[in-house]
Structure formats: structure tokens, C-alpha cells
Interface confidence: medium
Amino acid sequence: AGVFELQIHSFGPGPGPGAPRSPCSARLPCRLFFRVCLKPGLSEEAAESPCALGAALSARGPVYTEQPGAPAPDLPLPDGLLQVPFRDAWPGTFSFIIETWREELGDQIGGPAWSLLARVAGRRRLAAGGPWARDIQRAGAWELRFSYRARCEPPAVGTACTRLCRPRSAPSRCGPGLRPCAPLEDECEAPLVCRAGCSPEHGFCEQPGECRCLEGWTGPLCTVPVSTSSCLSPRGPSSATTGCLVPGPGPCDGNPCANGGSCSETPRSFECTCPRGFYGLRCEVSGVTCADGPCFNGGLCVGGADPDSAYICHCPPGFQGSNCEKRVDRCSLQPCRNGGLCLDLGHALRCRCRAGFAGPRCEHDLDDCAGRACANGGTCVEGGGAHRCSCALGFGGRDCRERADPCAARPCAHGGRCYAHFSGLVCACAPGYMGARCEFPVHPDGASALPAAPPGLRPGDPQRYL
């Protein structure tokens, strides 16, 4: 177990032209807050996929009002770190998404409005217990500077927080099989912590997070007694040799605990150990209220004034999920026709059409040659939504309006003279050179110096001149 910590140093305009407008104004004061989402591994997951390693929301920053006429400065930031606790091993490689949110403090009906200012993402390798790593990420015209680290929560140590340590009992040595926890020379490895909820009575482990059952017990947490179908005692312990191991019904069967709660049996029923933010008999009650700002992407939070009443997020167009955390990928339906490029702008869907097509979904095929003549005897050719002119000899350009000068590009090498001709061009070569473009020197003995054969071709093979 441990904590991923993120320290935001600055958020403001990036270098270069096109400085962004300040997100706040005198008429519309605002403040910033940040959200971090962590996923294990180096996967290129979509922004909407679950934050499997955890997520955290910062506090709100100080209220900021733009000074009229001033460029957008680095904006005032919330105090403190963003901390994402992780319960299991630190994976070493992870993906992150850091979102900068603006909370507008105007006179909106229904409280403050939130909007996403910038989102940066990346994939990194990081060992737990190491120093702070510094990073700079750009999102459009904005620049975010931050540091991050992963640290283990005692008694866990090591680059993955899988070794467990406690103060050593003697100054010079650890207990049997317990190695010193370098670099903490005064600490020793400590016992394994089994999978959360693993029955202490009927389960044990020899690896962190494991739950192995003693005889007579089964289930993921060793809470289900093994019953005997053809044995004498219906719920007593059975011998491994009798072949009577049939899982019996247990109160934790099917895990009645919601929202990631872990189930443990009690003499009469079961008990759920709920993760932070949930409570109730089955962890079905969320302790989050609208005051915690649970709705992302500008979702409007309704209800939930006290912890016992649930909140509901009303999501803006383009977002869904109980917290408006999932972006609806409206482009996946391929609404743009004729090869148009789909742009999901959040508030609207936009199609960028290929040449020759128009309309909100690029559904209209334009007749490119209609009313568009090619000059100087050229003929209009339609193709793939774009028009082009096939020009008569001696003319070029998009509409065949330019007189073609074949000698303009100086095609004759080694001082050869170029002459325009009705069939193209002719090179008159300087003494000592030959070829259609005067490219080959003529040797004094009369043999021409032909280019060397490229690798894989024999001299004399005609392909080498193609």
C-alpha cells in the first residue's frame, strides 16, 4: 500500500505566440482545481476508462479576477498535494491524466459552473520511494508544471511497496526469514498482509494479497464452509480423502457488498467492510455530497445535501456516467459522410469535409466542374471530390491559365542550353557531356562514365537506369 502524490507548481500560458485568454474576468471571477486519474501500465487507454489505480480531486484554488488588459498570468493554485492512495502493489509503470478545471463563481442558477480548461496525459515509469520527478506538459496554449512521486505507507517498503517492514526488535538483527529493509537499516521485513477480507480464522497467505483456505473452508475469502453432501456431518469439517467437498451456502456467497466492499461472515449473518466514501449494510450508501463536487465535465449536481441522500449528476451533451466522467464518443458512429473528419467539440459535433463535399455531415457531393472552366483548351476532370484541369500542351496551373515554360527549372545539366519545343524541351549539351539532360560526361577515349550499379544489380543490367 502507498500513496501517489502530485504537486502542481504552475498552470498558465505556454511559451510562444497565441497566449490564451484568462479564464476569469472581473464579471466572471473563477478559481481552479485539478483532478488526477491514474491507471496501471503504459496502456494508451481512453480518457474515459476507469482510473484503476485511483483518482483524486484537489481543493479549490483562491478566487481570481483578471486585471483588464493584462495577459493571462500563471493562475493561483490550490494549496497542498493531490494524493491518490493505492492499496495494492505500485505497478512501476503507470498512465496519468491531469485535468485543470475552472469553477465559475458568477450568478449561475443552481450554484457554480464547472468547465474543463485543459487535460494533459502521459505514460511514465516510476519506482516507489524515489525522489520527486518533475514534468512539464502542454495542452493547447496552456502549460502545466508539476512534480510527482509514489511513496509506500509503513510498513510497506520497496520499489513496488510489496515488502513490509516494522522497527527491528534488536539493534543488530531481524527475526527468522525477515531481511533488513534497506535503506531503512533499523527496520525488518514484517508479516504478509493477506487479501483484504481474507478470513483470519480460516484463511492464510504466503504472498501479499493472497487468501488460501484452511481445510473445511472455501470461497475467495475463505468464508464459505465446505458442506458434506453424502457425509455424516452436514456442515462439519470433512476429510480430504472422503470426496465430500461441496461448497455450502454462506452469507458472503456472491459478495453482497457493493462498491468494492469486502464481506466477512458473522455468527448470524455477514458484515461489509466498505471502502472510503461508502457505508451502509451493503456499502450501498455513498458518503459523497454535492459539496464535494462529484460531477465532472460541467455536470450539474442535484440533491445530496446530506450524506444520507444520494446526489445525481445531470450531464451536459457529450458526457455520461454517474459522475459525467465518460465522454460519449459520438464520432465512433462515423456520422461524417464521404471521408469527412469528425470533430467532437463537447458542446457540438463538427464534420470537416473533404474538397468537393459540403453539408453538416458532408452529405452533399459538389459538382466541382460546374461553372468552372479550364482555360486554354484544358478539360475539367472530376475525381474524389476534387476538380482538376487537364491542360493543353504548353499550359499549366490549376485552371490552365499559366503558360508553361519547360526551361524554367533549368533542366539541362553541366551548362547545357535548353530549348522549348512543341513536344517538350531539348538540351544542347556542352562539349564533353551527353544524355537527354546532359547528365553523363564523355571520356576522352570515347567511353561514357555510366553511373555505378546500385547494390544488388550487376553492371550492364538495364534496370539501373530506370
Epitope: P154, L164, P167, G177, P191, P200, C205, E206
Partner: antibody, heavy 120, light 112 residues
Framework: EVQLLESGGGLVQPGGSLRLSCAAS????????MSWVRQAPGKGLEWVAA????????YYADSVKGRFTISRDNSKNTLYLQMNSLRAEDTAVYYC?????????????WGQGTLVTVSS | DIVLTQSPATLSLSPGERATLSCRSS????????????LAWYQQKPGQAPRLLIY???SRATGVPARFSGSGSGTDFTLTISSLEPEDFATYYC????????FGQGTKVEIK
């Protein structure tokens, strides 16, 4: 019924060697960590060595480290303690004991013990 | 290693009386990650192997009568026998299994 039966004890001279065995029955031997615990005549209990269920990890008390080796053969349901460089202070009844689960669990079943006497 | 100190060394009581045995650890045997005390109590009679009574400081082992109970946390632990039966007169050992494995020196409960 869980049963642990030690054997191999006896009289040995200082510096000598002895190998103790513990035959286990009545439970799935390969699922449990096992220990050796000793008790000098008229004294208290002293833990000696332990081994995890698959034999991959072994643990020793400082007093026997480097001299004693614990091992197991899960196919024979047998636990062993190889004792080398024996000293007079190793004289004790040696008990074979089963843990409730892994190494970090209490011992729940004990054998009746085998006496090792180190004397010249 | 963690040192366990048991007191008293000898307890002289009559059948039916309440026995309170103490075990003090030189450092905590409470493991914060799972909030369990890695301490057990054993009963040993002359010429016999020890018998597990209590584990995790307060969980009674299978087949152990309800008159035996364990309590305490961290460094101070107690084994209580609510009403002594004739078969309870024996030596009792506390045992920690958190850092290495060590036993207390034992408390002998004898008939007064």
C-alpha cells in the same frame, strides 16, 4: 485427526549430526507451514526453525542458523530437521509442529516430541 | 528478538477460583496493517506436548472451553481462566509470532 510423529532422536556426541523426521497424517500436509520447537529439560519452549508449505522459504532461530537445516517432502508427508555441529546446549525434546496456515500463524498441533541428548 | 515476560512465575489457586495470567512484550506485537495481535497462549502438562488455547490474542482455538479467554493489545496481554477446573493446573506459555517466534518463560498454575 491430525497426527504428528517425530523420530530420529537419541544420544550423540558434541560436534556430531542427527536427522529428525516428522511423519504427518490426518490433514493436507502440503497446505501448511511447519516448525520445529524444542524444550530443554525443565526449561521453557524455544522455537528452532520453520518452513513454508511448498518448502520454498525457510526460517531459523539465530542459535541454530548455519548448523540446522529444515526441509520437507510433501509427497511423503514428512518434515525433516538435519542437525550438524551439535552442542551440549542443543539437548532437548524436539517437537514437530503445524502452523494454522502460513509462517505468520500460530502453531496449532504438536507431536509428542523426540529427545535429543548431546553429551560426551 | 521480542522478549516476552510472564508474571507471576507461579500462581497458587484452588479449583473454582479465577486465574489471571499476564504476558508483557518488549515491543508491540500489534501489526497495524491488519490490526491483529500476533500472540498465542499454550497450555502444557508434564510429559505432554503444548496445546493451543488462544491465537490472535483473543481467538479461542477449536475445542477450547469457554472458561479460557484472552485479552490485551500491543504489549500487554492477559489469559483469564474464569473458574479453574482440576485439569487446568498446568504451565501456560505466551508466544509471539510477529517478529521471529519467541515464547515467554511460562507461568505455572498449581493447586493451593
Amino acid at each position: 485427526e491430525v497426527q504428528l510423529l517425530e523420530s530420529g532422536g537419541g544420544l550423540v556426541q558434541p560436534g556430531g549430526s542427527l536427522r529428525l523426521s516428522c511423519a504427518a497424517s490426518g490433514f493436507t500436509f502440503s497446505s501448511y507451514a511447519m516448525s520445529w520447537v524444542r524444550q530443554a529439560p525443565g526449561k521453557g519452549l524455544e522455537w528452532v526453525a520453520a518452513i513454508n508449505s511448498n518448502g520454498g522459504n525457510t526460517y531459523y532461530a539465530d542459535s541454530v542458523k548455519g548448523r540446522f537445516t529444515i526441509s520437507r517432502d510433501n509427497s511423503k508427508n514428512t518434515l525433516y530437521l538435519q542437525m550438524n555441529s551439535l552442542r551440549a546446549e542443543d539437548t532437548a525434546v524436539y517437537y514437530c509442529a503445524r502452523h494454522r496456515g502460513g509462517f505468520y500463524y500460530a502453531v496449532d498441533y504438536w507431536g509428542q516430541g523426540t529427545l535429543v541428548t548431546v553429551s560426551s | 528478538d521480542i522478549v516476552l515476560t510472564q508474571s507471576p512465575a507461579t500462581l497458587s489457586l484452588s479449583p473454582g477460583e479465577r486465574a489471571t495470567l499476564s504476558c508483557r512484550s518488549s515491543q508491540s506485537v500489534l501489526y497495524s496493517s491488519n490490526q491483529k495481535n500476533y500472540l498465542a497462549w499454550y497450555q502444557q502438562k508434564p510429559g505432554q506436548a503444548p496445546r493451543l488455547l488462544i491465537y490472535w490474542a483473543s481467538s479461542r482455538a477449536t475445542g477450547v472451553p469457554a472458561r479460557f479467554s484472552g485479552s490485551g493489545s500491543g504489549t500487554d496481554f492477559t489469559l483469564t481462566i474464569s473458574s479453574l477446573e482440576p485439569e487446568d493446573f498446568a504451565t501456560y506459555y505466551c508466544h509471539q509470532y510477529l517478529s521471529s517466534r519467541t515464547f515467554g518463560q511460562g507461568t505455572k498454575v498449581e493447586i493451593k
